[in-house]
Interface confidence: low
Amino acid sequence: MRHRTIHLFRKGLRLHDNPALLAALQSSEVVYPVYILDRAFMTSSMHIGALRWHFLLQSLEDLRSSLRQLGSCLLVIQGEYESVVRDHVQKWNITQVTLDAEMEPFYKEMEANIRGLGEELGFQVLSLMGHSLYNTQRILELNGGTPPLTYKRFLRILSLLGDPEVPVRNPTAEDFQRCSPPELGLAECYGVPLPTDLKIPPESISPWRGGESEGLQRLEQHLADQGWVASFTKPKTVPNSLLPSTTGLSPYFSTGCLSVRSFFYRLSNIYAQAKHHSLPPVSLQGQLLWREFFYTVASATPNFTKMAGNPICLQIRWYEDAERLHKWKTAQTGFPWIDAIMTQLRQEGWIHHLARHAAACFLTRGDLWISWEEGMKVFEELLLDADYSINAGNWMWLSASAFFHHYTRIFCPVRFGRRTDPEGQYIRKYLPILKNFPSKYIYEPWTASEEEQKQAGCIIGRDYPFPMVDHKEASDHNLQLMKQAREEQHRIAQLTRDDADDPMEMKLKRDHSEESFTKTKAARMTEQT
């Protein structure tokens, strides 16, 4: 039987390596490509901020354009998820709904509800995994039904699984031509709304444009420089690279505009040809596996995005201080490097990997002793690449609530920035009020004399705040609190403790042997390090 199918786009906003879409096209006489824009769900469950809205709408517009080139269309239907599915299944005589399988609890619940509707209304539901390298369920099974809680253990499991599945082929115009297109006029009725339609404030200066086309273009740009890819290591990149020296692809992976499997295999080919390559976990492929690690742990850990009821997370009595949180969030901490980071985050929706470390450490265990959950919510709202599992995992990591064991290492908000960007160009760009300070003061302008401050056109305490805490005092005090928490909860602290250094601490390791680097899977490569 040839189906009448609705293909529901959720996070997989792309045509390449889209198993569920391809399955829909191969099994159907008509396919309705649909994106349900459920604003209440997206605000309450996904906490999308303005920049993320813009990125999403651009991604949908791009998807619409790509489908149009193949002789189809994208139908963006606004409304509550279940009602939309119920109405349109009946209206269009649908016999099958295909969708990408996701692991977030809210997406799982959505899928369960759609399956319930399927039983009630008599349509099949096919969900296929396309957002991760591996099927997380399979990893859990090989680990005895529980998530591997250390990266090392995770890689051992991966070595049993072999390579990730290869990406599926791209759909063609012929695939779409085999199915009847959606009825006359539907594309006009269900266009991609403009931000103004959704009362979203105008876009600021974010340099990121949403969509598969843009993602693929960036991917090609970066992969063109094979030497760059093969020598990518996280510790060497610096946050003041205004055009990021990291891949600049993360928002495209988190929305599914880019396939992580396609990227993985493209990298495999490049590594195979490279003589001197950086090995995981600091290589690009290694970074993809960290992502996979967090996905896997999140998929089987209750309350992964919370402290309470989260079995792998230290239960810490963080300060509840709305005023301090607000100052951090709105770039008024009085530490220029932290404030520059938070300004870039708000303006552009992206900050460098090291900048995330600094901002998170400052908010939590370093200076303010505010819960990582609060920081996670801010990042979830503002980061274009916000991703349920990775965001929560990294915040637990950086607050030393899980995964991290170098908890005595605290980033100094003055020295850490100065080490990576001695002239303070990054601060001058994002905090122009400070741009006239000499380099020796730019990270700690409160140390300049009143005369020097006047010359710089910025009086501390009037034009820019004094530091909200004494870093030395605060970090010493917080370190004692952390030691105490870890001693009292030794068992939890050990659960996710890994002997392997985290990506921040990995020293660059090169393969100097003449032996050519084969396409051995990344997990095995890692075990050599």
């Epitope: 790509s66 149009r68 297109p181 009825e183 006029g185 103004t196």
Partner: antibody, heavy 124, light 107 residues
Framework: EVKLEESGGGLVQPGGSLRLSCATS????????MSWVRQPPGKALEWLGF??????????EYSASVKGRFTISRDNSQSILYLQMNTLRAEDSATYYC???????????????WGQGTSVTVSS | DIVMTQSHKFMSTSVGDRVSITCKAS??????VAWYQQKPGQSPKLLIY???TRHTGVPDRFTGSGSGTDFTLTISNVQSEDLADYFC?????????FGGGTKLEIK
């Protein structure tokens, strides 16, 4: 029956302005994107821009050659499309056509119905 | 901008013959290509959209094919009323662009 009829063409001096109109009937005007296209005598067609439909809040796109000088607008109550042309140059001399951009299945976003055209001559 | 190139400015054919008019895009436009016919002294008429779909009322002797960068309009069993200019157009990305046109002459 879909009908489009341009008017307002004529002779104008360089630097001058002109407003072309396109009266439409036979379809729900607010549902469609509407384009302007021109054709200098004996030459190829050139797309000037379009105005989107109601669902897309009537936003516009223009080709680089006319952006900033020409403005496309529409009167939805009367189903009329306009092209306001300012700072006209000799090279703007052409027959100007309005056209409806087809929906997904009635023209696949190509221009499925055209007016008969109105002639504009820019000369001193 | 995407450039649409129709390499033959003129093509000559006889009634009953089959003729193919080609159009090349400077970059991949998928199947977002239309073909228009413009008879002398008239406005253009849409013949083909999505590279191969005939518009309502267009005789089936007009056939479009191609995808990516190479496109063809084929007229089989040419009739005298087919004497006209034929233009290709891409609507894959802004600005929409037309080919320079091919004038079909009947011997």
């Amino acid at each position: 029956e879909v009908k489009l009829e341009e008017s307002g063409g004529g002779l104008v001096q360089p630097g001058g302005s002109l407003r072309l109109s396109c009266a439409t009937s036979g379809f729900t005007f607010t549902d469609y994107y509407m384009s302007w296209v021109r054709q200098p005598p004996g030459k190829a067609l050139e797309w000037l821009g379009f105005i989107r439909n109601k669902a897309n809040v009537y936003t516009t796109e223009y080709s680089a050659s006319v952006k900033g000088r020409f403005t496309i607008s529409r009167d939805n109550s009367q189903s009329i499309l306009y092209l306001q042309m300012n700072t006209l140059r000799a090279e703007d001399s052409a027959t100007y056509y309005c056209a409806r951009d087809g929906g997904y299945d009635d023209g696949g976003y190509a221009m499925d119905y055209w007016g008969q055209g109105t002639s504009v001559t820019v000369s001193s | 901008d995407i450039v649409m190139t129709q390499s033959h400015k003129f093509m000559s054919t006889s009634v009953g013959d089959r003729v193919s008019i080609t159009c090349k895009a400077s970059q991949d436009v998928g199947t977002a290509v239309a073909w228009y016919q413009q008879k002398p002294g008239q406005s253009p008429k849409l013949l083909i959209y999505w590279a191969s779909t005939r518009h309502t009322g267009v005789p089936d002797r007009f056939t479009g094919s191609g995808s990516g960068t190479d496109f063809t309009l084929t007229i089989s069993n040419v009739q005298s009323e087919d004497l006209a200019d034929y233009f290709c157009q891409q609507y894959s990305s802004y600005p929409y662009t037309f080919g320079g046109g091919t004038k079909l002459e009947i011997k």
